[in-house]
């Protein structure tokens, strides 16, 4: 067997089992598990006289190591005295020694609960220049305790004179404070409050929590826009990760296909938001045919602040298809805004919800930033609807008074597009698509003053058409109300006017 140093244990009786009139008591020290022989046991009895007896070593059958017991009998005022048993094992090393200091007997005791509390962040969630850790040692039977602070398991040089002890009834509590610099706290080290009491060790540890609360992180994966898919024929999908806390760690986004086929090269963009969070987008070009044939694309997101990898997948929407109905309208002139008009486009009853809306003037597509389009909303039936709003200037309509609202949708035939033309002054314009048939729905402009309808373009509303029914969510004034009554005019007409 190889050299093995001993484990040393104090041997004491329970205090309640020692008669109060006992003039002498015996205590012991067990040295076990050592090899080879011998060990040397000596006692420090302080001011008291004592006799010692070391029993012959015995062999531990399983390991072949040795164990021995040394007994100390003392007389006199032993109750308040501490005794030290000193065990030396020179085969381990010439200076190998283990000291155990203990009293004659052990009392029943209630062990302490150890808990570390830390100072809070400031209102903005940032750490102050210094961080206080408070170690609460509570609910123990009064007696000597030793508190040690550790940093990543190493003893710290801390002034423990600030520790204070209070007694409540039969139990005591102690608290010790540790002040750390922000730099130390942010270094991700673990701080431990270690309490030694009645020969036992109790502890609690703490460290800086992860920078972000992962509850806020979200990932989304978009489908390609119908415009990119059917018109440009270069569809892309985008993986969006929002509400990340900026940190040392980077977001890792990995693309894959359910079929296992390779993916194209993706582009990535990171943006710091005004609220301090980070938004990461990765855009992947996909094959038009692959998408239409139902390939599933997956975006895998990992980040140090995410408890686990996230996966988002996207594929062509399944279910019934329905082509959009498109209606385009112009609002009347508004007092004080003679040189501007708002055009509106209602696109409804389409399925699935993926749709692209464009406005054209002079056969040229206007920039997306020019118009504002709502997100698809469900109709009372099974389809979806959107509104799109475009502001046009006098210069534009005087150049050519025809604006086209176009919807791109997979169910539209023959070329995945449906469009309607609208004029600012329909009576003056040379026949727009809008005036070719009576619309199923009529839009009225809800003026501030309720009054009689004013003719626009020589037409009047049907008496059953009324405003205020079914107002849509509209991005800014002027507000438009959908008239839900069917228009029953016999002649083809359109009407826009004050209600």
């Amino acid at each position: 067997a190889s050299t093995q140093s001993p484990s040393v244990f104090p041997l004491t009786r329970c205090c309640k089992n020692i008669p109060s009139n006992a003039t002498s008591v015996t205590l012991g020290c067990l040295a076990t598990g050592y090899f080879p022989e011998p060990v040397m046991v000596t006692w420090d009895t302080g001011s008291l006289n004592g006799t010692t007896m070391t029993l012959p070593a015995t062999t531990l059958t399983l390991s072949g190591h040795y164990a021995t017991i040394s007994l100390l009998t003392v007389s006199g005022a032993w109750a308040k005295q501490m005794f030290t048993c000193r065990v030396a094992h020179t085969p381990s090393s010439t200076d190998w020694v283990d000291n155990k200091t203990f009293s004659v007997c052990s009392r029943d005791f209630t062990p302490p609960t150890v808990k570390i509390l830390q100072s809070s962040c400031d209102g903005g969630g940032h750490f102050p220049p210094t961080i206080q850790l408070l170690c609460l040692v509570s609910g123990y039977t009064p007696g000597t305790i030793n508190i040690t602070w550790l940093e990543d398991g190493q003893v710290m040089d801390v002034d423990l004179s600030t520790a204070s002890t209070t007694q409540e009834g039969e139990l005591a509590s102690t608290q010790s404070e540790l002040t750390l610099s922000q730099k130390h706290w942010l270094s991700d080290r673990t701080y431990t409050c270690q309490v030694t009491y009645q020969g036992h060790t109790f502890e609690d540890s703490t460290k800086k929590c992860a920078d972000s609360n992962p509850r806020g992180v979200s990932a989304y994966l978009s489908r390609p826009s119908p415009f990119d898919l059917f018109i440009r024929k270069s569809p892309t999908i985008t993986c969006l990760v929002v509400d990340l806390a900026p940190s040392k760690g980077t977001v890792n986004l990995t693309w894959s296909r359910a079929s296992g086929k390779p993916v194209n090269h993706s582009t990535r963009k990171e943006e710091k938001q005004r609220n301090g969070t980070l938004t990461v987008t990765s855009t992947l070009p996909v094959g038009t045919r692959d998408w239409i044939e139902g390939e599933t694309y997956q975006c895998r997101v990992t980040h140090p602040h995410l408890p686990r990898a996230l996966m988002r997948s996207t594929t062509k929407t399944s279910g019934p298809r329905a082509a959009p109905e498109v209606y385009a309208f112009a609002t009347p002139e508004w007092p004080g805004s003679r040189d501007k008009r708002t055009l509106a486009c209602l696109i409804q009853n389409f399925m699935p919800e993926d749709i692209s809306v464009q406005w054209l003037h002079n056969e040229v597509q206007l920039p997306d930033a020019r118009h504002s389009t709502t997100q698809p909303r469900k109709t009372k039936g099974s389809g979806f609807f959107v509104f799109s709003r475009l502001e046009v200037t006098r210069a534009e309509w005087e150049q050519k008074d025809e604006f086209i609202c176009r919807a791109v949708h997979e169910a539209a035939s023959p070329s995945q597009t449906v469009q309607r033309a609208v004029s600012v002054n329909p009576g003056l314009a040379g026949g727009s698509a809008q005036s070719q048939r009576a619309p199923d729905r009529v839009l009225c402009h809800s003026g501030q003053q309720q009054g009689l309808p004013r003719a626009a373009g020589g037409s009047v509303p049907h008496p059953r058409c009324h405003c205020g029914a079914g107002r849509a969510d509209w991005p800014g004034p002027p507000e438009l109300d959908v008239c839900v009554e069917e228009a029953e005019g016999e002649a083809p007409w359109t009407w826009t006017g004050l209600c």
């Epitope: 992860a210 609360n213 992962p214 509850r215 894959s256 997101v301 408890p307 686990r308 990898a309 996966m311």
Partner: antibody
Framework: QVQLVESGGGLVQPGGSLRLSCAAS????????MTWVRQAPGKGLEYVSI???????WYANWASGRFTISRDNSKNTVYLQISRLRAEDTATYYC?????????????WGQGTLVTVSS | DIQMTQSPSSVSASVGDRVTITCQAS??????LAWYQQKPGQPPKLLIY???TLASGVPSRFSGSGSGTEYALTISSLQPEDFATYYC????????????FGGGTKVEIK
């Protein structure tokens, strides 16, 4: 094939501590987020803690403070240290592997190790 | 925290029956609802992930459906080996949660 073998369970006195180990084989541990789930006798599954591939960890609210999850990829081992054990910690503790691609749950479980807390 | 509420807590059924177990989340889950089967003395086994994708080696009589907050596991024709306890799990830990597992549904022989 993928194997997860838990050890370190047994009978412990209230207030005591123990460290559970989970030896992983048949896959690259560093590629997977790992989770500990426990199940009290006759009860349902209860999530305890997760450690991601970066070594960062999260705990169920009730587990915070007494439970410590860690991993040593070089030893292909995941650990769960439990301190100040209570009777209600008596359960079978399962070490579990999260799917590699994420958001898809646990694709492999160990057989579990039983922890009994009793005086 | 997202809470998962599973119902019923137990169901008695016969071989050949169609059994549906539901799971309701307290908030919408973007992806990552999983279903597990557990037999006595064994660890759980993954049946379905990503709401509706069948795990490798799982018979096609098992199916998962749902979105948002409402999910279901259906066994189209119950077999003798299907008598077990079933758990749903919210497996999308970006929304870190205490109670990622439902309370379980025990499928017993009628």
């Amino acid at each position: 094939q993928v194997q997860l073998v838990e050890s370190g369970g047994g009978l412990v006195q209230p207030g005591g501590s123990l460290r559970l180990s989970c030896a992983a084989s048949g896959f690259t541990l560093s590629n997977h987020d790992m989770t500990w789930v426990r199940q009290a006798p006759g009860k349902g599954l209860e999530y305890v803690s997760i450690i991601n591939t970066y070594g960062n960890h999260w705990y169920a609210n009730w587990a915070s403070g007494r439970f410590t999850i860690s991993r040593d990829n070089s030893k292909n081992t995941v650990y769960l240290q439990i301190s100040r054990l209570r009777a209600e910690d008596t359960a079978t503790y399962y070490c579990a592997r999260e799917t590699h691609h994420g958001s898809s749950g646990i694709d492999h479980w160990g057989q579990g190790t039983l922890v009994t807390v009793s005086s | 925290d997202i809470q998962m509420t599973q119902s019923p807590s137990s169901v008695s059924a016969s071989v050949g029956d169609r059994v549906t177990i539901t799971c309701q989340a307290s908030e919408s889950i973007y992806s990552g609802l999983a279903w597990y089967q557990q037999k006595p003395g064994q660890p759980p086994k993954l049946l379905i992930y990503d709401h509706s994708t069948l795990a490798s080696g799982v018979p096609s009589r098992f199916s998962g459906s749902g979105s948002g907050t409402e999910y279901a596991l259906t066994i189209s024709s119950l077999q003798p080996e299907d008598f077990a306890t079933y758990y749903c799990q919210h497996a999308d830990y970006a929304h870190h949660s205490d109670n990622v597992f439902g309370g379980g549904t025990k499928v017993e022989i009628k």
